[in-house]
């Protein structure tokens, strides 16, 4: 039988390379059974994670999984950094692994590469 514990499936040490000025959706995969937990995003500042209260978020439901999405519309240079999602479930707090956004400020680039070129350059 499927476990009904809430789990947050952000991959350990996951990273995303993105361009300032582009839209981006940061996804927190959430497993739950009956009642969807309350999920929030925070941004790491040293050892503390500052809750993102005023940001646009949404849910996307798929087979066996839901995604709590943090919207960046558009990505700003100061969005660079590490993020974590957290779920409150039956008075328990479950925290995800952190995921890091590396933002390239296109103003400082002499020529704007495509997103795919930039991603492959960055990660190669």
């Amino acid at each position: 039988k499927e476990s009904c514990d809430v789990q947050l499936y952000i991959k350990r040490q996951s990273e995303h390379s993105i361009l300032a000025g582009d839209p981006f959706e940061l996804e927190c995969p959430v497993k739950y059974c009956a009642n969807r937990p309350h999920v929030t995003w925070c941004k790491l500042n040293g050892t503390t994670c500052v809750k993102l209260e005023d940001r646009q978020t949404s849910w996307k439901e798929e087979k066996n999984i839901s995604f709590f999405i943090l919207h960046f519309e558009p990505v700003l240079p100061n969005d660079n950094g590490s993020y974590r999602c957290s779920a409150n479930f039956q008075r328990n707090l479950i925290e995800s692994h952190s995921t890091t956004l590396y933002v390239t400020d296109v103003k400082s680039a002499s020529e704007r590469p495509s997103k795919d070129e930039m991603a492959s350059r960055f990660w190669a």
Epitope: S3, H16, S120
Partner: antibody, heavy 118, light 111 residues
Framework: EVQLQESGPSLVKPSQTLSLTCSVT????????WNWIRKFPGNKLEYMGY???????YFNPSLKSRISITRNTSKNQYYLQLNSVTTEDTATYYC????????????WGHGTTLTVSS | DIVLTQSPASLAVSLGQRATISCRAS??????????MHWYQQKAGQPPKLLIY???NLESGIPARFSGSGSRTDFTLTINPVEADDVATYYC?????????FGGGTKLEIK
């Protein structure tokens, strides 16, 4: 229904570069994780790496100096490039989707068989 | 890397009997508070097919004759009862830690 289809050469000479394409229908490569796996003649399966929904990549450290995974979102295709191939790279190459939810591989291509030989 | 050791390497079972395949991990598989161990079936000339995900969950469309169990380092795939169509090679896979790794495979034959 999600379908993946590998394409590329069946024969490559040693020291050349292998380039494979995975064409995806029924899902967008801007969601989920898109992987390459290979199966050697002795039946061993090796995980090669992925490109994620954002375009970020991960490569198996055993291949890191030789491998590249890129994508074309408008064609809904992603690509494997493996440099400086040797006979040890003879294998069947599969592309597969990872469901976020546990990162298992729920959809696979049929595979393309590569022989490295002079 | 996490090494997955499958046993036995090959297995011959009579129709209607139980087949049990073991997968032992060199490290604990529980980073997400969950066992990210999965089982695949591969028939000749076909790609691997997901049977069991996260140790014990049956993929949709897979017969209930297949079941998975285990946690931490020891995992088991059970087929009961075995049918002629089950002739294949079975692989365990962990996605708990990079790089993802597969077991060496267990070839199931009918006795």
């Amino acid at each position: 229904e999600v379908q993946l289809q590998e394409s590329g050469p069946s024969l490559v000479k040693p020291s050349q570069t292998l380039s494979l394409t995975c064409s995806v229908t029924g899902d967008s490569i801007t969601s989920a994780y898109w992987n390459w796996i290979r199966k050697f003649p002795g039946n061993k399966l090796e995980y090669m790496g992925y490109i994620s929904y954002s375009g970020s990549t991960y490569f198996n450290p055993s291949l890191k100096s030789r491998i590249s995974i890129t994508r074309n979102t408008s064609k809904n295709q992603y690509y494997l490039q493996l440099n400086s191939v040797t006979t040890e790279d003879t294998a069947t190459y599969y592309c597969a989707r990872s469901h976020y939810y546990g990162y298992y591989f729920d959809y696979w291509g049929h595979g393309t068989t590569l022989t490295v030989s002079s | 890397d996490i090494v997955l050791t499958q046993s036995p390497a090959s297995l011959a079972v009579s129709l209607g009997q139980r087949a049990t395949i073991s997968c032992r991990a060199s490290e604990t598989i529980d980073s997400y508070g969950d066992s990210l161990m999965h089982w695949y079936q591969q028939k000749a000339g076909q790609p691997p097919k997901l049977l069991i995900y996260r140790a014990s969950n049956l993929e949709s469309g897979i017969p209930a004759r297949f079941s998975g169990s285990g946690s931490r380092t020891d995992f088991t795939l059970t087929i009961n009862p075995v049918e002629a169509d089950d002739v294949a090679t079975y692989y365990c896979q962990q996605t708990d830690e990079d790089p993802y790794t597969f077991g060496g495979g267990t070839k199931l034959e009918i006795k």
